[in-house]
């Protein structure tokens, strides 16, 4: 899988879309997980409704929401109030039994809020044609976790 880069601005919302073959993945729940390391575990952030027919209902875990258009074949994840620590490598997954197929690998890049200069250095906003070797950039205009919370506890 190639990696798709989604860029968002700190404090704003970022919407990530993962297209898939609706027939091939018919009847399967979906999930969004964070890759904790290059070869480490992908820790579940949020998954779609337990009843596949209700996958269109938005489910939240903290500041992250997931909803699935099972007919159109598009999984949508919303990261609300984006924070620098939300950056990272994620996966959209299709679940079957205890297995998970990767629908898309997503790199979330968090750009500093241009109006907030507390932590940011010089800002540069990439143009639409910015290219990556094996990553496609998607621009998205766009509850921070408490320090003591586990970043992404598994969800059912």
């Amino acid at each position: 899988h190639n990696t798709t880069v989604f860029q968002g601005v700190a404090g704003q919302s970022l919407q990530v879309s993962c297209p898939y073959d609706s027939m091939k993945h018919w009847g399967r729940r979906k999930a969004w997980c964070r890759q904790l390391g290059e070869k480490g575990p992908c820790q579940r952030v949020v998954s779609t409704h337990n009843l596949w027919l209700l996958s269109f209902l938005r489910r939240w875990n903290g500041s992250t929401a997931i909803t699935d258009d099972t007919l159109g074949g598009t999984l949508t994840i919303t990261l609300r109030n984006l924070q620098p620590h939300d950056a990272g490598l994620y996966q959209c997954q299709s679940l079957h039994g205890s297995e998970a197929d990767t629908l898309r690998k997503v790199l979330v890049e968090v750009l500093a809020d241009p109006l907030d200069h507390r932590d940011a250095g010089d800002l540069w906003f990439p143009g639409e044609s910015e290219s990556f070797e094996d990553a496609h950039v998607e621009h998205s205009i766009s509850r921070s976790l408490l320090e003591g919370e586990i970043p992404f506890p598994p969800t059912s």
């Epitope: 860029q7 390391g37 290059e38 990272g88 790199l107 979330v108 890049e109 500093a112 800002l123 540069w124």
Partner: antibody, heavy 119, light 107 residues
Framework: EVQLLESGGGLVQPGGSLRLSCAAS????????MAWVRQAPGKGLEWVAS????????YYADSVKGRFTLSRDNSKNTLYLQMNSLRAEDTAVYYC????????????WGQGTLVTVSS | DIQMTQSPSSLSASVGDRVTITCKAS??????LAWYQQKPGKAPKLLIY???NRFTGVPSRFSGSGSGTDFTLTISSLQPEDFATYYC?????????FGQGTKLEIK
């Protein structure tokens, strides 16, 4: 194999400037956050600055904010650290590191380059 | 900023010993902790991330545990190549801060 090779260190007078470079290979450079971590002689590790994968945003430790500028050239797989208004306390080995995005841990390190600030 | 304090600062042990190094955060950091090993004149190497995940190629004798404010790096059976300085690091929320290090020496 991931490789990070720093260059540009040396002796500089207080108030002077220096530019460090880090040539990266063995991975898709443009997909990774990068950072510099330094270590003063006989001391522990100190995070200096981090940069997002596109170069869109930079983050600095308070100790270097306003004096150091981090940048990258993804077409050349190279990371840069421009250091201005150098002080004696900036004397350290500077390590170029690959940061696991959003997590702030450093999975690969260069061999380091020594910066000495002295008159 | 959150401070990371390691103990002991130095430790003497023998090959085959079980060794424990602790790291204490001044505030709750959840499971957001990494451990590194550094040998003299060399760059640090990542050992453990997110408290308990071993990095690629790290031997199974290294393990990490803890949560909140108290963390432990354990070497189950010390090998000659393990004599080094070990650092903990608070991760996930910047600024990324390191402990002062624990030097593990041969007894």
């Amino acid at each position: 194999e991931v490789q990070l090779l720093e260059s540009g260190g040396g002796l500089v007078q207080p108030g002077g400037s220096l530019r460090l470079s880090c040539a990266a290979s063995g991975f898709t450079f443009s997909n990774y956050y990068m950072a510099w971590v330094r270590q003063a002689p006989g001391k522990g590790l100190e995070w200096v600055a981090s940069l997002t994968n596109s170069g869109g945003s930079t983050y600095y430790a308070d100790s270097v904010k306003g004096r150091f500028t981090l940048s990258r050239d993804n077409s050349k797989n190279t990371l840069y650290l421009q250091m201005n208004s150098l002080r004696a306390e900036d004397t350290a080995v500077y390590y170029c590191t690959r940061e696991w995005a959003g997590s702030g841990y450093f999975d690969y390190w260069g061999q380091g380059t020594l910066v000495t600030v002295s008159s | 900023d959150i401070q990371m304090t390691q103990s002991p600062s130095s430790l003497s042990a023998s090959v085959g010993d079980r060794v424990t190094i602790t790291c204490k955060a001044s505030q709750n950091v959840g499971n957001n902790l990494a451990w590194y090993q550094q040998k003299p004149g060399k760059a640090p190497k990542l050992l453990i991330y997110y408290t308990s995940n071993r990095f690629t190629g790290v031997p199974s004798r290294f393990s990490g545990s803890g949560s909140g404010t108290d963390f432990t790096l354990t070497i189950s059976s010390l090998q000659p190549e393990d004599f080094a300085t070990y650092y903990c690091q608070r991760i996930y929320n910047s600024p990324w801060t390191f402990g002062q290090g624990t030097k593990l020496e041969i007894k």
